[in-house]
C-alpha cells in the first residue's frame, strides 16, 4: 500500500537537487579563491539538515544557521546590487562589473538560485512531487525562509550607495510584495546606507517616458525617505547599450544618456 503523501500546490524539489547543490558549491569554491577552504560536503549536510525530516510549513531561520555559518563570506558593503523582477539583467551586469555583487553572486545565493526544495515531516526523504506554495499553502516553507533569511542579511550588510535594478516593463515597477519591497527595503541600515539609487530598466526601444515619476517609484521614495535614507532614480532607456557601456565605458556613444 503506497504511503499517503501530502500534496502541495507548488512544484516539487528540483531534479537532482543534492548533486546540483554539491556541484555548484565545488564550482563556486574553485572560482573564488577566498572560499577554497569551504568543505562542500559539510555545506550540503548543513543545507540538507535545514529541511530534511521537518514539516515543510514549519521551517525557521534557525534551521538555516549551520548553513549560514559555513557560507560566511565578506561582501564589500558599498558594492551591493539589489534587483526586483529583473534578475537576468542584474546578473549580466555583475558579470561585467565584477566588483559589484548581487545576492546570487555570493556562495549561498549561487547554491540556491532557481532551485526548489522541501522534505517531509519525520522521514529522511526529499519531496520531488510537490512543495508548499508561498500563497496557497504556507509562507514558512524551506525556499521562502531561506531567501527571506539571506535577503534580509544581505540588505543589512549594505552601506554607502546601494543600487537596485527595477523592471520598468511591469505594471508595478516597485512591488511592495516582492522580496526587495517586503524584506530588503526595510532592512537597509540608515546609519550605514546613505543613498538607495534605483535603476529603472525600460523594455521598449521607443519608450522615452520618465519612469522615475511612476507612482510606485514615488511610493518607494517615500518609504526610503521615512527611513532617513536618500533616494535617487535613473532611467535606463537602453539596457543593451547600458551593458555595452559598462563593458566599454570609453566608447564615444556612452557619454549620452543610456
Amino acid at each position: 500500500v503506497p504511503r499517503w503523501r501530502q500534496q502541495w500546490s507548488g512544484p516539487g524539489t528540483t531534479k537532482r537537487f543534492p548533486e546540483t547543490v554539491l556541484a555548484r558549491c565545488v564550482k563556486y569554491t574553485e572560482i573564488h579563491p577566498e572560499m577554497r577552504h569551504v568543505d562542500c560536503q559539510s555545506v550540503w549536510d548543513a543545507f540538507k539538515g535545514a529541511f530534511i525530516s521537518k514539516h515543510p510549513c514549519n521551517i525557521t531561520e534557525e534551521d538555516y544557521q549551520p548553513l549560514m555559518k559555513l557560507g560566511t563570506q565578506t561582501v564589500p558593503c558599498n558594492k551591493i546590487l539589489l534587483w526586483s523582477r529583473i534578475k537576468d539583467l542584474a546578473h549580466q551586469f555583475t558579470q561585467v562589473q565584477r566588483d559589484m555583487f548581487t545576492l546570487e553572486d555570493t556562495l549561498l545565493g549561487y547554491l540556491a538560485d532557481d532551485l526548489t526544495w522541501c522534505g517531509e515531516f519525520n522521514t529522511s526523504k526529499i519531496n520531488y512531487q510537490s512543495c508548499p506554495d508561498w500563497r496557497k499553502d504556507c509562507s514558512n516553507n524551506p525556499v521562502s525562509v531561506f531567501w527571506k533569511t539571506v535577503s534580509r542579511r544581505f540588505a543589512e550588510a549594505a552601506c554607502d550607495v546601494v543600487h537596485v535594478m527595477l523592471n520598468g516593463s511591469r505594471s508595478k515597477i516597485f512591488d511592495k510584495n516582492s522580496t526587495f519591497g517586503s524584506v530588503e527595503v526595510h532592512n537597509l541600515q540608515p546609519e550605514k546606507v546613505q543613498t538607495l539609487e534605483a535603476w529603472v530598466i525600460h523594455g521598449g526601444r521607443e519608450d522615452s517616458r520618465d519612469l522615475c515619476q511612476d507612482p510606485t517609484i514615488k511610493e518607494l521614495e517615500s518609504i526610503i525617505s521615512k527611513r532617513n535614507i536618500q533616494f535617487s532614480c535613473k532611467n535606463i532607456y537602453r539596457p543593451d547599450k547600458f551593458l555595452q557601456c559598462v563593458k566599454n565605458p570609453e566608447d564615444s556613444s556612452c557619454t549620452s544618456e543610456i
Epitope: Q65, T74, Q189
Partner: antibody, heavy 120, light 107 residues
Framework: QVQLVESGGGLVQPGGSLRLSCAAS????????MHWVRQAPGKGLEWVSY????????YYADSVKGRFTISRDNSKNTLYLQMNSLRAEDTAVYYC?????????????WGQGTLVTVSS | DIQMTQSPSSLSASVGDRVTITCRAS??????LNWYQQKPGKAPKLLIY???NLQSGVPSRFSGSGSGTDFTLTISSLQPEDFATYYC?????????FGQGTKVEIK
C-alpha cells in the same frame, strides 16, 4: 542608533564568579553572531568567545574553556558571559562585538567595555 | 591556532608621513583579515575588512592590501587623529586571533 552597552564588571576575588551583560539596540539582534573580546591592562586584544544568532552554537578560547559560558536572550536583545573560577589573569576590559552573518566576517560595532578586576 | 604577527610593535611618525604596518599569518588565510584602530580608553574601531575593503565612514587615506600570509595597512598621509594602536585580526578559522598591535606615536 546602533549600540552595544556592557555591564556587570567589577572587583571579584580569585575563584569567584561574575556575569557580564551586553544590551543591544538599534539593529536586528538575531542577524548577528555575538562575540566577547577582552583586553588586559596595557596589553593587546584577546578573543574570548562567540555565539551564533540562535544561541545553539558556541566557541571558546582555550584560556577560558570550561570556566566561561556565553549565552544570549534574543527576546531581550541581550548577550551574556558567565565567568566562573576567575583568575588574576582574567583581569581585563571585556568588550562585546557584533558580526553580521553570513555576509560579514568582521566586528563592525563594539561596546564601550566593562572592567573586570580579579584580586584578593 | 593561527598566529598573527605584526611589525613593527611601535613606530614614531610625523603628521603627513606615509605609514605602513605589516601583519603576517602563520598559515594561509586568503583574504580573511581585518584591521582595527584603538585609541586609549576606547573600544576598537573597524578600519579595513576582507584585507582591502574600507569600512564605511573611514577616511580614504587608510588602505589595506595582501593575501595569503602577508598583509599591509597603509596610512597615506598621517593625521593627528591617527595616532593610536592598530590591530590585525584573522577570521579564517576559530579561534579568531589578533596581532599584538602596532602603536603609532608622534615623533
Amino acid at each position: 542608533q546602533v549600540q552595544l552597552v556592557e555591564s556587570g564588571g567589577g572587583l571579584v576575588q580569585p575563584g569567584g564568579s561574575l556575569r557580564l551583560s551586553c544590551a543591544a539596540s538599534g539593529f536586528t539582534f538575531t542577524s548577528y553572531y555575538m562575540h566577547w573580546v577582552r583586553q588586559a591592562p596595557g596589553k593587546g586584544l584577546e578573543w574570548v568567545s562567540y555565539i551564533d544568532s540562535s544561541g545553539s552554537s558556541t566557541y571558546y578560547a582555550d584560556s577560558v574553556k570550561g570556566r566561561f559560558t556565553i549565552s544570549r536572550d534574543n527576546s531581550k536583545n541581550t548577550l551574556y558571559l558567565q565567568m566562573n573560577s576567575l583568575r588574576a589573569e582574567d583581569t581585563a576590559v571585556y568588550y562585546c562585538a557584533r558580526q553580521l552573518m553570513p555576509f560579514g566576517g568582521y566586528f563592525d560595532v563594539w561596546g564601550q567595555g566593562t572592567l573586570v578586576t580579579v584580586s584578593s | 591556532d593561527i598566529q598573527m604577527t605584526q611589525s613593527p610593535s611601535s613606530l614614531s611618525a610625523s603628521v603627513g608621513d606615509r605609514v605602513t604596518i605589516t601583519c603576517r599569518a602563520s598559515q594561509n588565510i586568503s583574504q580573511w583579515l581585518n584591521w582595527y584602530q584603538q585609541k586609549p580608553g576606547k573600544a576598537p574601531k573597524l578600519l579595513i575588512y576582507g584585507a582591502s575593503n574600507l569600512q564605511s565612514g573611514v577616511p580614504s587615506r587608510f588602505s589595506g592590501s595582501g593575501s595569503g600570509t602577508d598583509f599591509t595597512l597603509t596610512i597615506s598621509s598621517l593625521q593627528p587623529e591617527d595616532f593610536a594602536t592598530y590591530y590585525c585580526q584573522q577570521y579564517y578559522d576559530l579561534p579568531n586571533t589578533f596581532g599584538q598591535g602596532t602603536k603609532v606615536e608622534i615623533k
